[in-house]
């Protein structure tokens, strides 16, 4: 929801988080602020504190509940509202109707490890954190390696358009230091928008064998 | 259905501790996550502490530290134990179980008073 220069933008892992950032310019530095959550077919309800994290936006984390609960489902609508105390009561600043599987964006991939390497090839998996079995296998992951004297920025990006856990990275140089991360996205919803990278993955390529081509 | 029955509430004075138990029945194998959320005199249910079936837990801000959530499956049973109470933890404190598929579950609700 944007408000003149307000912006409120909320994104559900598809389990129990609903995470939300507000950026307002020219909004109060002092002001106490805080995000509630109320659900239209739930008896429960949820707020969390905003808390600063650059000159003009501000975020938190509504936690529904333990971390793989499913606390939400595709026919949930969620009234998400950003309240700012002004002296005894609570001023509503930015409103929306929150629907959890239209704004996915789930954690970042975790338990990276080299299954196997080789001089010019690695094989690396990884797993999925906290997301709702809903998505089955409709998920599709990005990743990247990290080669010596390149960004991440610079490194090109390898596209898993199903739900695979696993890479054979092909065509990495001898004896040579690597970087490696991936993220996740599931294919529903329309404002669905890709996890975080995960931790980078550091490994080395096996040198080559001596007296032998590279 | 899932069936949740609370017990373990009552009058407290500050500073005490009390240990509330929620018992499920039913179709207890659909059950993932089970919670305790409160209730007080605002009329919003929010909530106080969260378990998964694996044991994973979520605590609310407010009670961090003082309270702690465990479970044991064998027997259906949730508790919450609850240490160094204020009278701001004053509320109905409700079971909740929530399934695989998304449907949430709650008991009666069980009464908590911190006197002063």
């Known amino acids: 929801a944007v408000n003149g220069t307000s912006q409120f933008t909320c994104f559900y892992n598809s389990r129990a988080n609903i995470s939300c950032v507000w950026s307002q310019d020219g909004a109060l530095q002092d002001t106490s602020c805080q995000v509630h959550a109320w659900p239209d077919r739930r008896r429960w309800n949820q707020t969390c504190e905003l808390l600063p994290v650059s000159q003009a936006s501000w975020a938190c984390n509504l936690i529904l509940g333990a971390p793989d609960s499913q606390k939400l489902t595709t026919v949930d609508i969620v009234t998400l509202r950003v309240l700012c105390r002004e002296g005894v009561r609570w001023r509503v600043m930015a409103i929306q109707d929150f629907k959890p599987f239209e704004n996915l964006r789930l954690m970042a991939p975790i338990s990276l490890q080299v299954v196997h390497v080789e001089t010019h090839r690695c094989n690396i998996s990884w797993e999925i954190s906290q997301a709702s079995h809903y998505f089955e296998r409709h998920l599709e992951f990005e990743a990247r390696t990290l080669s010596p004297g390149h960004t991440w920025e610079e490194a090109p990006l390898l596209t898993l358009k199903q739900k695979q856990e696993w890479i054979c990275l092909e065509t990495l140089t001898p004896d040579t230091q690597y970087e490696f991360q991936v993220r996740v996205k599931p294919l529903q919803g329309e404002f669905t928008t890709w996890s975080p990278w995960s931790q980078p993955l550091a490994f080395r390529t096996k040198p080559a064998a001596l007296g032998k081509d590279t | 259905q899932v069936q949740l029955q609370e017990s373990g509430g009552g009058l407290v004075q500050a500073g005490g501790s009390l240990r509330l138990s929620c018992v499920a029945s039913?179709?207890?194998?659909?059950?993932?996550?089970m919670a305790w959320y409160r209730q007080g005199a605002d009329n919003q249910r929010v909530l106080v502490a969260a378990?998964?079936?694996?044991?994973?837990?979520a605590y609310g801000d407010s009670v961090k530290g003082r309270f702690t959530i465990s479970r044991q499956n064998a027997r259906n049973t949730v508790y919450l134990q609850m240490n160094s109470l204020k009278p701001e933890d004053t509320a109905v404190y409700y079971c909740?179980?929530?399934?695989?598929?998304?449907?949430?579950?709650w008991g009666q609700g069980t009464q908590v008073t911190v006197s002063s």
């Open positions: 039913g179709s207890v194998s659909s059950i993932n996550g």
């Open positions: 909740n179980a929530d399934s695989w598929g998304g449907d949430d579950y």
């Open positions: 378990i998964s079936r694996v044991g994973n837990t």
